[in-house]
Interface confidence: low
């Protein structure tokens, strides 16, 4: 992880990097590695892509172990094939108002982005595109068989969407905070980002947090009860420690994760909170990183479509962050 030891290169002669990713010498001048990209975790050994003007932002001097690849002040953004300058706001479609900031794009939905769970008056909600309207609207399908009766409906509820009001006014400052982006990994440790000016100087800044929607090793489908199609928030049997680039969380956490469905629905975080987690590294150094913790998940048909950059960003966004 740091450069004190001798050079040991695992992948000779050199790794094959995906298209558009530079092959660079690691930060120790030892091995050729695939450069980390915008928003990815970086270390001294795993440098960011210099050809894209990225640097490893460690956040604070106390965290000089693991950072996030960040673009330099004023770096432009490439979004949907168009280049936007830092500070530029644009409407990416009728559904999203976006801002480019130092190479990162943060967007705020112009349409209601609520996840609607079944309720007594709408047991089978579905989002549909209506002709001539930009924003999709909820419709209530009739159940295919009318077997849901009485007490069974008590389990249904409409979950509120919590979170900061993006148009909150503070003294001489129109406070705007974009939604947390979807976790960069569908399993394992990833990064989630947002853009906000909710600070003392009302300046736009990027914020990032670690996130884990579900562990990669968990075979969650096995836990789905007979006759059910989903496991929304599977119970984790024992408290776990988080791992981050060779460093381990100092505390154990009984964290909630999102489950899976067998009928094509996907389960994503619905309400989350952000808390600091301290990681201890092999050399004894301790670093503190903000991390997303899931309160509730929702299973729905609004799954990210590979063909729609916005749907994949926003139907998997972190609803209702409480932090």
């Amino acid at each position: 992880q740091n450069c004190s030891g001798p050079c040991r290169c695992p992948d000779e002669p050199a790794p094959r990097c995906p298209a558009g990713v530079s092959l660079v010498l690691d930060g120790c001048g030892c091995c050729r590695v695939c450069a980390k990209q915008l928003g990815e975790l970086c270390t001294e050994r795993d440098p960011c892509d210099p050809h894209k003007g990225l640097f490893c932002d460690f956040g604070s001097p106390a965290n000089r172990k693991i950072g996030v690849c960040t673009a330099k002040d004023g770096a432009p953004c490439i979004f949907g094939g168009t280049v936007y300058r830092s500070g530029e706001s644009f409407q990416s479609s009728c559904k999203y108002q976006c801002t480019c900031l130092d190479g990162a794009v943060g967007c705020m939905p112009l349409c209601s982005m609520d996840v609607r769970l079944p309720s007594p008056d709408c047991p089978f909600p579905r989002r549909v595109k209506l002709p001539g309207k930009c924003c999709e609207e909820w419709v209530c399908d009739e159940p295919k068989d009318q077997t849901v009766v009485g007490p069974a409906l008590a389990a249904y509820r409409l979950e509120d969407t919590f979170g900061p009001d993006p148009t909150m006014i503070r003294a001489n400052c129109l406070v705007q905070t974009t939604e947390w982006s979807a976790c960069s990994k569908t399993c394992g440790m990833g990064i989630s980002t947002r853009v906000t000016n909710d600070n003392a100087s009302c300046r736009l800044e990027k914020q990032s947090r670690l996130c884990m929607v579900r562990p990669c090793e968990a075979d969650l489908e096995e836990n789905i009860k007979k006759g059910k199609k989903c496991i929304r928030t599977p119970k984790i049997s024992k408290p776990i420690k988080f791992e981050l680039s060779g460093c381990t969380s100092m505390k154990t956490y009984r964290a909630k994760f999102c489950g899976v469905c067998t009928d094509g629905r996907c389960c994503t975080p619905h309400r989350t909170t952000t808390l600091p987690v301290e990681f201890k590294c092999p050399d004894g150094e301790v670093m503190k990183k903000n991390m997303m913790f899931i309160k509730t998940c929702a299973c729905h048909y609004n799954c990210p479509g590979d063909n729609d950059i916005f749907e994949s960003l926003y139907y998997r966004k972190m609803y209702g962050d409480m932090a």
Epitope: H51, D73, G74
Partner: antibody
Framework: QVQLKQSGPGLVQPSQSLSITCTVS????????VHWIRQSPGKGLEWLGV???????DYNAAFMSRLSITKDNSRSHVFFKMTSLQTDDSAIYYC????????WGQGTTLTVSS | QAVVTQESALTTSPGGTVILTCRSS?????????ANWVQEKPDHLFTGLIG???NRAPGVPVRFSGSLIGDKAALTITGAQAEDDAMYFC?????????FGGGTKVTVLG
């Protein structure tokens, strides 16, 4: 529309200081940085320094010891101060917006002479 | 400190294409140098044309384009017009500071 307006003296004596204020309109100093550049017949354009939108600064190493760039976001002012002026500091001094140096001030012509 | 070199003068005709280049003394120019191109018209009127190698500033005609050609940054004027007769400067970023080139005088004969 975007504008940068400069105000400052035209004549300064050797060893004195130069102070220029760049007042911006049409954009926020919390969104764009502001660069300072000078143009002199013998040296062409010389980049002097920048104050980034977050308040950080970078300076040309040749001027670092005598250059200071600060700002007041709420009043949209950027302040440029260069000390220990010599005759070869005579030039036109410009402020310009970050992002391709897309907008420039009208320039402040400085003559250093006793 | 790096030295940034430009052609001292180039000539083109109205409707013609001209390519200005910007070379760094310390190696190939890359996107990390955030090449900027600035136009100077008479009476010291400066306008930024291109930032970040290839991003056109607002209101800049599409005939101006920025790119990397080999180990240099380049500004291409496609379909030159009389009003493009001006001085053009490039500036390259070196991690903590910009360095300007000496400028290229473009003459549009017509």
């Amino acid at each position: 529309q975007v504008q940068l307006k400069q105000s400052g003296p035209g004549l300064v004596q050797p060893s004195q200081s130069l102070s220029i204020t760049c007042t911006v309109s049409g954009f926020s100093l919390t969104t764009f940085g502001v660069h300072w550049i000078r143009q002199s017949p013998g040296k062409g354009l010389e980049w002097l320094g920048v104050i980034w939108r977050r308040g950080g600064t970078d300076y040309n190493a040749a001027f670092m010891s005598r250059l200071s760039i600060t700002k007041d976001n709420s009043r949209s002012h950027v302040f440029f101060k260069m000390t220990s002026l010599q005759t070869d500091d005579s030039a036109i001094y410009y402020c310009a917006r970050d992002g391709g140096f897309d907008y420039w001030g009208q320039g402040t012509t400085l003559t250093v002479s006793s | 400190q790096a030295v940034v070199t430009q052609e001292s003068a180039l000539t083109t005709s109205p409707g013609g294409t001209v390519i200005l280049t910007c070379r760094s003394s310390i190696g190939a120019v890359t996107t990390s140098n955030y090449a900027n191109w600035v136009q100077e018209k008479p009476d010291h009127l400066f306008t930024g044309l291109i930032g970040g190698t290839s991003n056109r500033a607002p209101g800049v005609p599409v005939r101006f384009s920025g790119s990397l050609i080999g180990d240099k940054a380049a500004l291409t004027i496609t379909g030159a017009q009389a009003e493009d007769d001006a001085m053009y400067f490039c500036a390259l970023w070196y991690s903590t500071h910009y360095v300007f080139g000496g400028g290229t005088k473009v003459t549009v004969l017509g």
